[in-house]
């Protein structure tokens, strides 16, 4: 009888992660008597995958009944394949022997390649908020995919971005890969409702790319503009002064009124109105009793927005005459003022 040959008909097998791999192996003879074993890799460091004789291999099932002497089909199925299972598998026939079974003949090997889907892309923005006109960086990461070929695109509100850098690691052969990309985005005042999207396309996704998003509302800070105005007289000795805080984001804002540099009242923005672009407006007013002042009064609206240094606008009230309806729109920042009083 011709000497036994071990035949592995498939040079390679491609399997999607999570599925079952079938590794085929047949022998051409029933002799010699002895077990079949499957290994991943060759040489001294090879990993035992299945031993017909002994051991527990919960992920492995045999295609045919290997317990029977007349069996010559030694194919196995490996369940729940992961990228870590990739490699070359060898079907090896042993001859029954003492003290140990002796390796008799090996198959040529079957390379198992695993197609694994990338994980959902995770997009993260800068740790601190930034203001319009500043450039911020966003990162996108996805892991665990195989094969290595992958495409990554960035979008802002549906418009593809071009200023980004992408790396796929590792550079050499691996069971699975990771992608890391950094995109630069210039912020505008209208970006509160904007989204940055990272899109990953891979052969395992069958044309349906994965997307990760970041809302620029988590990244942007739109500083407020202030306007202090004097309203018509309410009573003979009272003046109503308003501070309009416009176009700010996020909502966290504290306003302090100062009369001649002394704190008169502090309040936190609560009932704000939202603009279409996602920014907020808020108005605070101060009722000033003119008769309580002998000299002119300098009123300052001081706003601390989102933990940033305070900005302010001032308005001068003269007490020498009864004030009439007047408006003030001072352009000076911080404690500066630009008087325009009408009597």
């Amino acid at each position: 009888e011709e000497e036994l040959q071990v035949i592995q008909p498939d040079k390679s097998v491609l399997v999607a992660a999570g599925e079952t791999a079938t590794l085929r192996c047949t022998a051409t003879s029933l002799i010699p008597v002895g077990p079949i074993q499957w290994f991943r890799g060759a040489g001294p460091g090879r990993e035992l995958i299945y031993n017909q004789k002994e051991g527990h291999f919960p992920r492995v099932t045999t295609v045919s009944d290997l317990t029977k002497r007349n069996n010559m089909d030694f194919s196995i199925r490996i369940g729940n394949i992961t990228p870590a299972d990739a490699g070359t598998y060898y079907c090896v026939k042993f001859r029954k022997g003492s003290p140990d079974d002796v390796e008799f003949k090996s198959g040529a090997g079957t390379e198992l390649s695993v197609r694994a889907k990338p994980s959902a892309p995770v997009v993260s923005g800068p740790a601190a908020r930034a203001t319009p006109q500043h450039t911020v960086s966003f990162t996108c990461e996805s892991h665990g995919f195989s094969p290595r070929d992958i495409t990554l695109k960035w979008f802002k509100n549906g418009n593809e971005l071009s200023d980004f850098q992408t790396n796929v690691d590792p550079v050499g052969e691996s069971v699975s890969y990771s992608i890391h990309s950094t995109a630069k985005v210039v912020l505008t005042r209208e970006d509160v409702h904007s989204q940055v999207i990272c899109e990953v396309a891979h052969v395992t996704l069958q044309g349906d790319p994965l997307r990760g998003t970041a809302n620029l509302s988590e990244t942007i800070r739109v500083p407020p503009t202030l306007e202090v105005t004097q309203q018509p007289v309410r009573a003979e000795n009272q003046v109503n002064v308003t501070c309009q805080v416009r176009k700010f984001y996020p909502q966290r804002l504290q306003l302090t009124w100062l009369e001649n540099g002394n704190v008169s009242r502090t309040e936190t923005a609560s009932t704000v109105t939202e603009n279409k672009d996602g920014t907020y407006n808020w108005m605070s007013w101060l009722l000033v009793n003119v008769s309580a002042h002998r000299d002119d009064v300098k009123l300052t609206c001081q706003v601390e927005h989102d933990g940033q240094p305070a900005v302010s606008k001032s308005h001068d009230l003269k007490v020498s005459a009864h004030p009439k309806e007047q408006g003030s729109n001072t352009a000076a920042e911080n404690t500066g003022s630009n008087e325009r009083n009408i009597y």
Epitope: K53, R69, N70, K96, S98
Partner: antibody, heavy 118, light 107 residues
Framework: EVQLVESGGGLVQPGGSLRLSCAAS????????MHWVRQGTGKGLEWVSA???????YYPGSVKGRFTISRENAKNSLFLQMNSLRAGDTAVYYC????????????WGQGTMVTVSS | DIQMTQSPSSLSASVGDRVTITCRAS??????LAWFQQKPGKAPKSLIY???SLQSGVPSKFSGSGSGTDYTLTISSLQPEDFATYYC?????????FGQGTKLEIK
Amino acid sequence: EVQLVESGGGLVQPGGSLRLSCAASGFTFSSYDMHWVRQGTGKGLEWVSAIGTAGDTYYPGSVKGRFTISRENAKNSLFLQMNSLRAGDTAVYYCARGGNWDDAFDIWGQGTMVTVSS
Amino acid sequence: DIQMTQSPSSLSASVGDRVTITCRASQGINNYLAWFQQKPGKAPKSLIYTASSLQSGVPSKFSGSGSGTDYTLTISSLQPEDFATYYCQQYNSYPYTFGQGTKLEIK
């Protein structure tokens, strides 16, 4: 149904010969190693002979040169030719199939009695 | 030749008992050990092969273990039909050899 049926046993004088047969059915006979095992009255089991799928044969020292195992795959039959019989060969002779991958016996016949006596 | 020594040679037990029979080989047999059950006037019946693999159709109350030279057969809960003679056999190398048998009797 997988079955082994022995025949050919009987009374024989010391120095005589006997040919035992084992008829196999219910499986592909040619694909299995086959064995003969005997058991003396009130005694334990003793392996007597084996034949592989390729016709290779094996014997213990106690019967070597006297017993010959053979097979006829076309007729699904196993044979044991016993020559120069001795009183110590008196036993029930069983044929057994090396039915497991490792040649462990999985199926046994019901046995045939061989008595060597003058 | 490899000698197989079984112990005990006889054993009395009750229904429901758990019993263990041991078999020692004169040299390593690489787990190529089988266990058989035989009742009077009947052919042996295969129970276990390769030291611990259960033959098809054999109830799981029978289990085998061991390696090297020392092997055991355990019957977890004896039933009346389990009272018989048990043999071990090495088939690692020719000539195949059997133990002398263990007769399991009802106490």
